[in-house]
């Protein structure tokens, strides 16, 4: 069983999923309002968003006293965060600016990918090896969407029997999408294109917030029970509370290299020939050069206009 990394508003913690009755280890303490969290295992980096400080920060998990600001301007409510461990990029949602953005892992070369028809975007999950990203939106028209990680091919994949879609996670091995709905109190799964939808846990969950997966087990945080729960990812059976008495459980991830499988990085050689951003894409050649917001990509499709 994995270590579970979760945000707890005031801190980030790690707890062993097999021994959740033990106290969790504080990875980073003294925080204001840590909401979303993710990591790049191979780089030893943990990222989180703080919705009160309106910032995204990071630390090296062997040097937890070294907290760095990554994005500190232009954020209002960065509810969702995801690291592209392959292309070495950071993606985030903001439910008040109504944007989905991307940058380098250090926060540089920031680009707005989506800014239209977003209401309350929240969870975001990446599948870098196929070039797709997924996100939930619990606004007036709740939905789950999929798009290329380069901002292409945007498509609504779930828009029925959905109300407050919060948690979202991908099963890379079985190519499945799992999500938790806090108002309809369930966990459902589907194919990555939204087809073949099935219930995993039927409407019995008080307020599931964030969702992760490791091997055959789903793990999620619940706002109402202030705990982390788990069940079998196929059947929903064995539903149990594995860690309780959490101050304010927010985002959660299975903290393991297994959750960030290696694959060929199409941007790996010379940044794909791109002058600035090289983003994963779902279509051949599986990457797309891009420029920071406000800067034009030249006709060669590789170079950003001077001044970026």
């Amino acid at each position: 069983a994995p270590l579970l990394l979760y945000a707890n508003r005031r801190d980030l913690r790690l707890v062993d999923a097999t021994n959740g009755k033990e106290n969790a280890t504080i990875v980073v303490g003294g925080l204001e309002d840590a909401a979303a969290v993710d990591f790049v295992f191979s780089h030893g980096l943990i990222y989180w968003s703080d919705v009160s400080e309106e910032a995204i920060k990071r630390t090296e998990f062997n040097k937890t006293e070294s907290v760095q600001n990554v994005v500190v301007s232009g954020l209002l409510s960065p509810d969702g965060l995801a690291c592209d461990w392959l292309g070495e990029k950071l993606y985030w949602t903001d439910s008040e600016t109504n944007r989905i953005e991307v940058s380098n892992l250090d926060g540089s070369l920031r680009k707005v990918l989506f800014w239209q028809e977003l209401d309350q975007p929240r969870a975001i999950a990446l599948d870098p090896s196929s070039g797709f990203m997924y996100w939930t939106d619990w606004g007036e028209v709740p939905k789950i969407e999929r798009a290329g990680m380069d901002g292409s091919s945007r498509f609504i994949i779930i828009n029925s029997e959905i109300y407050w879609p919060n948690g979202l996670t991908l099963d890379y091995e079985e190519q499945k999408l799992y999500w938790a709905d806090a108002k309809l109190n369930f966990i459902h799964k589907s194919n990555l294109d939204g087809t073949n939808r099935q219930a995993v846990v039927k409407g019995s969950l008080p307020h599931p917030f964030a969702l992760t997966l490791f091997e055959d087990i789903l793990y999620w945080t619940d706002w109402s029970t202030h705990s982390i729960l788990a069940c079998n990812k196929y059947t929903g059976e064995g539903l149990r509370e594995i860690h309780s008495d959490i101050f304010s459980p927010m985002d959660i991830h299975a903290f393991s290299q297994q959750r960030q499988p290696n694959a060929t990085n199409p941007c790996g050689i010379d940044n794909g020939g791109c002058s600035h951003l090289c983003l994963m894409s779902p279509v051949k050649p599986f990457y797309q050069c891009a420029c920071p917001t406000g800067v034009k990509l030249l006709e060669n499709g590789k170079t950003c206009k001077d001044g970026a």
């Epitope: 309002d33 409510s77 619990w138 806090a182 307020h207 304010s248 927010m250």
Partner: antibody, heavy 123, light 108 residues
């Protein structure tokens, strides 16, 4: 438009009971936390109690804990405050106020208020 | 819980800028909300999350929050702005609102 209408206030003797109601309209009641806030004559605002969107979570100010009970009926779009063992210092205008959307992470303010109902505790 | 302190009264001439302070230990670490209450009426939210204005609130209302003091600023104060103003904050864990004692704004 959002409307909150309180009722049930009146004159009651010390040690007595009263039940306040708040009828809501103009929004999806079951999506929001709702609160009671009171104001003693000539004094400031005091938060009294709050209840989560589903009713599963309730909170009380120390001054009313054990005496007041907040509840809601989402099928009737109505909030309640059962007040027992009333004291003279509970005399106030009681407002019901809409709190945060149930799925919001960090917003805890009261964006719409009713006009209030007066509770007078006196012998 | 943080204790919020406001001046009991502030006076301003019409058209001038009124500033109402709300102090509390490390208040910058909390979101601050401001409510306006006119005599015999219910409170109205005028500023949320330190500096954001709800729709329908005039642009002359603004807010800031740093150090140990949050400030509500009313630029070009009008007679209709005469009211009591309350600052408020809330703990991240639960929904208890904490209100300041209120400030009576008089427009001379």
């Amino acid at each position: 438009q959002v409307q909150l209408v309180e009722s049930g206030g009146g004159l009651v003797q010390p040690g007595g009971s009263l039940r306040l109601s708040c009828a809501a309209s103009g929004f999806t009641f079951s999506d929001y936390a709702i609160h009671w806030v009171r104001q003693a004559p000539g004094k400031g605002l005091e938060w009294v109690s709050g209840i989560s969107y589903s009713g599963s979570s309730t909170h009380y100010a120390d001054s009313v804990k054990g005496r007041f009970t907040i509840s809601r009926d989402n099928s009737k779009n109505t909030l309640y405050l059962q007040m027992n063992s009333l004291r003279a210092e509970d005399t106030a205008v009681y407002y019901c106020a809409r709190g945060s959307h149930g799925n919001i992470m960090a917003k805890r303010y009261f964006d719409f208020w009713g006009q209030g109902t007066l509770v007078t505790v006196s012998s | 819980d943080i204790e919020l302190t406001q001046p009991p009264s502030v006076s301003v001439a019409p058209g001038q800028t009124a500033r109402i302070s709300c102090s509390g230990d490390n208040i910058r670490k909390k979101y601050v909300y401001w409510y306006q209450q006119k005599p015999g009426q219910a409170p109205v939210l005028v500023i949320y999350e330190d500096s954001k204005r709800p729709s329908g609130i005039p642009e002359r209302f603004s807010g800031s929050n740093s150090g140990n003091t949050a400030t509500l600023t009313i630029s070009g104060t009008q007679a209709e702005d005469e009211a009591d103003y309350y600052c408020s904050t809330a703990d991240s864990g639960i929904n208890n609102g904490v209100f300041g004692g209120g400030t009576k704004l008089t427009v001379l």
